[in-house]
Interface confidence: low
């Protein structure tokens, strides 16, 4: 009789990324018999939960269940029913919840407790909800991109599977920008990692990696903006803040109570003689850049070299994948092309920020004004962070690759997190098997 292929033997996993500004659910799929192979896990679905990040539900925890419903129902549809009970579900909360925990451990626990109870109601194998550390966030992001780029594979390919792939096995560094924190993770070249908190050792597929990582809490794009506003309103000592990071003609009223809600602005807090102030955009890239630089304390460094705020940073090495908000913002600004030099990016930002708000609104009519208004700040912040914060130069800029997806999977920490928790990255190189991709009977 003719050989017949067995029914597809696949597995699924679900990871929820509970970020500071929103939650996303990712569904991953892989062939069951090739769990230990590199590069076999891929993303089949992303579902963005409608609404803010889970930390915003602190006063309305009863709404969390409804909040998660749509995406969890979507997971029910995508994953075959026969697989539901063996599909692990993980929720990792990042810097938004780290900040809430800093304010009140009790409130953070309350939110996570309700999240766990809500997720336990689904027919999947719920594995828990937790606040991951900044170090984990950096490490898992690094694992994700290098796994997807095939950097852990010992087999030499005769074809390139990804646009960024160089033929060597040197890993990519990972640059992750969220709303509340930003991570930098890479393998330094023969450099001692002077600060133990920033050192990670991995053994993956038979190879040792000494990895540097740091997560800068409060330096995600949203919290950086709050910091900048809190810093600048001190100087204003009045109800108008003429802000170079917003387009000329843009106006927005900000409540002082909202400004001081986050622990990130505590260092700038002062008693202001008003309850509200108005941002008035003046759209000047250079001034915006200068204002942002004041958020980085570069005057103190107890190591051979630092990023900012006294945090050790080894000399940059190799190529870097910049993802999450690094990618979304640069993609919107049309600046992700490898051909665009740093000087060109700066030039484009100058022009963009100087465009009148009315003109911007007309040009990008489909974009929500809240997001649209902040691209000038976010783009300038990205440049400031990469150049002055992490010490990229005009020359090393070409080693930054703004990455949204690799092989159809989003760049970010979630895949690395799942690979780790499902033990799908072996320490040793698996023995190669003579079996081809299909098993016949």
């Amino acid at each position: 009789t003719q050989n017949k292929a067995l029914p597809e033997n696949v597995k699924y996993g679900i990871v929820l990324d509970a970020g500071s500004s929103h939650t996303s659910l990712y569904i991953y799929k892989w062939p069951a018999e090739k769990e230990n192979d590199t590069g076999v896990v891929h993303q089949v679905e992303e579902c963005r939960v409608k609404g803010p990040g889970i930390s915003k539900f602190v006063q309305k925890v009863n709404e969390i269940g409804i909040y998660l419903t749509d995406c969890m129902e979507r997971a029910r549809e995508v994953i075959p029913r026969s697989q539901h009970q063996e599909t692990p579900v993980y929720l990792g909360a990042t810097a938004g919840m780290r900040l809430l925990r800093m304010e009140s451990e009790e409130l953070a626990d309350r939110v996570l407790d309700v999240v766990e109870r809500s997720l336990s109601n689904y027919p999947f194998d719920f594995q828990g909800a937790r606040i991951i550390t900044g170090q984990e966030e950096g490490a898992y992001g690094w694992i994700t991109i290098n796994y997807l780029l095939g950097k852990f594979s010992q087999k030499t390919r005769w074809f390139s599977i990804v646009p960024y792939e160089t033929n060597n096995q040197e890993t990519f560094g990972a640059l992750d920008l969220g709303g509340a924190s930003t991570q930098v993770t890479f393998v330094p070249q023969n450099q001692t990692i002077e600060s133990p908190d920033n050192a990670l050792q991995f053994r993956l597929y038979g190879k040792d990696y000494n990895v540097y990582t740091h997560s800068f809490l409060c330096y995600g794009k949203d919290q950086a903006l709050w910091q900048k506003l809190a810093k600048d309103i001190q100087v204003a000592s009045n109800e108008i803040l003429r802000d170079p990071c917003f387009h000329p003609g843009y106006k927005k009223v900000v409540n002082v109570s909202d400004l001081y809600k986050t622990p990130c602005t505590k260092r700038f807090e002062m008693t202001l003689p008003f309850q509200q102030f108005e941002i008035q955009g003046i759209g000047n890239y250079q001034q915006c850049h200068q204002s942002i630089l004041e958020l980085f304390n570069t005057s103190y460094c107890p190591y051979s070299q630092c990023a900012f705020n006294g945090i050790f940073l080894p000399p940059l090495q190799g190529d870097f994948g910049a993802f999450s908000a690094f990618y979304f913002v640069m993609k919107f600004l049309n600046l992700t092309s490898e051909k665009v030099s740093q000087e060109k990016v700066t030039e484009m930002m100058k022009k963009f920020c100087a465009q009148p708000w009315e003109e911007i609104k007309t040009s990008y009519a489909g974009v929500k004004e809240k997001y649209l208004s902040e691209y000038c700040f976010s783009g300038t912040y990205i440049l400031s962070l990469l150049l002055q914060g992490y010490h990229f130069t005009a020359d090393s800029w070409e080693h930054i690759h703004f990455i949204g997806k690799i092989q159809g999977s989003d760049a970010g920490w979630t895949l690395g997190y799942m690979l780790n928790l499902t033990n799908m990255i072996p320490a040793e190189q698996p023995l190669s098997t003579p079996l081809s991709h299909s098993t016949y009977v």
């Epitope: 810093k231 001190q234 100087v235 204003a236 109800e239 002062m270 003689p273 108005e278």
Partner: antibody
Framework: EVQLVQSGAEVKKPGATVKISCKVS????????MHWVQQAPGKGLEWMGR????????KYAEKFKNRVTITADTSTNTVYMELSSLRSEDTAVYYC????????????WGQGVMVTVSS | DIVLTQSPALAVSPGQRATITCRTQ??????????MNWYQQKPGQPPKLLIY???SLASGVPARFSGSGSGTDFTLTINPVEADDTANYYC????????FGGGTKVEIK
């Protein structure tokens, strides 16, 4: 060039009300906070209050709180200061002045208006 | 209100250094920015800004004028003094609305 031109000198009786104007040329008053400062003869400068003409929000010094009203007319680019229940110690020169965000050096003053309160 | 106290009067010979002090009841610093300004006023004229943010020289002001200090203690220095510097000098804080010091009368001997 920004210029602040104030209205003419006034002589008022005790208990009366005076209203002084300050017309700004060269820039919109909405770009500034407009302050009023009192200077009695031979005395120092005393801040009275200010207005944010863009929102018509005002702040007053405790000493003048119940008697002073600062208003703005953005159509004529003019700011007004009204002082009521005048008494002899209100005899002074009254200046209007601009303030942008401190740290930006944009500081303009009117020439001053002499108000004499006498029975 | 933030109260500002100035030395009341000063007599200086031309070519000498004049030092005017201003003490604030509470700090006018905030995270590295110092909201202290200095004005010169001559009879019959409005005040003229000399120094802003404690030490920045306003445009058109001669370099003979300088400002220093932080927190609660501030100094305006005129060096060398010229005959034309006879005037009243006021410190002013703009950290929280405005308040002026009582003024220092500088006479050239």
């Amino acid at each position: 060039e920004v210029q602040l031109v104030q209205s003419g000198a006034e002589v008022k009786k005790p208990g009366a009300t005076v209203k002084i104007s300050c017309k700004v040329s060269g820039d919109s008053i909405t770009a500034y906070f407009m302050h009023w400062v009192q200077q009695a003869p031979g005395k120092g400068l005393e801040w009275m209050g200010r207005i944010d003409p863009d929102h018509e929000r005002t702040k007053y010094a405790e000493k003048f709180k119940n008697r002073v009203t600062i208003t703005a007319d953005t159509s004529t680019n003019t700011v007004y200061m009204e002082l009521s229940s005048l008494r002899s110690e209100d005899t002074a020169v009254y200046y209007c002045a601009t303030e942008r965000v401190p740290g930006f050096e944009t500081d303009y003053w009117g020439q001053g208006v002499m108000v004499t309160v006498s029975s | 209100d933030i109260v500002l106290t100035q030395s009341p009067a000063l007599a200086v010979s031309p070519g000498q250094r004049a030092t005017i002090t201003c003490r604030t009841q509470q700090t006018v610093d905030h995270y590295g920015t110092t909201y202290m300004n200095w004005y010169q006023q001559k009879p019959g004229q409005p005040p003229k800004l000399l120094i802003y943010l404690a030490s920045s020289l306003a445009s058109g002001v001669p370099a003979r004028f300088s400002g220093s200090g932080s927190g609660t203690d501030f100094t305006l220095t005129i060096n060398p003094v010229e005959a034309d510097d006879t005037a009243n000098y006021y410190c002013q804080q703009s950290r929280n609305l405005w308040t002026f010091g009582g003024g220092t009368k500088v006479e050239i001997k």
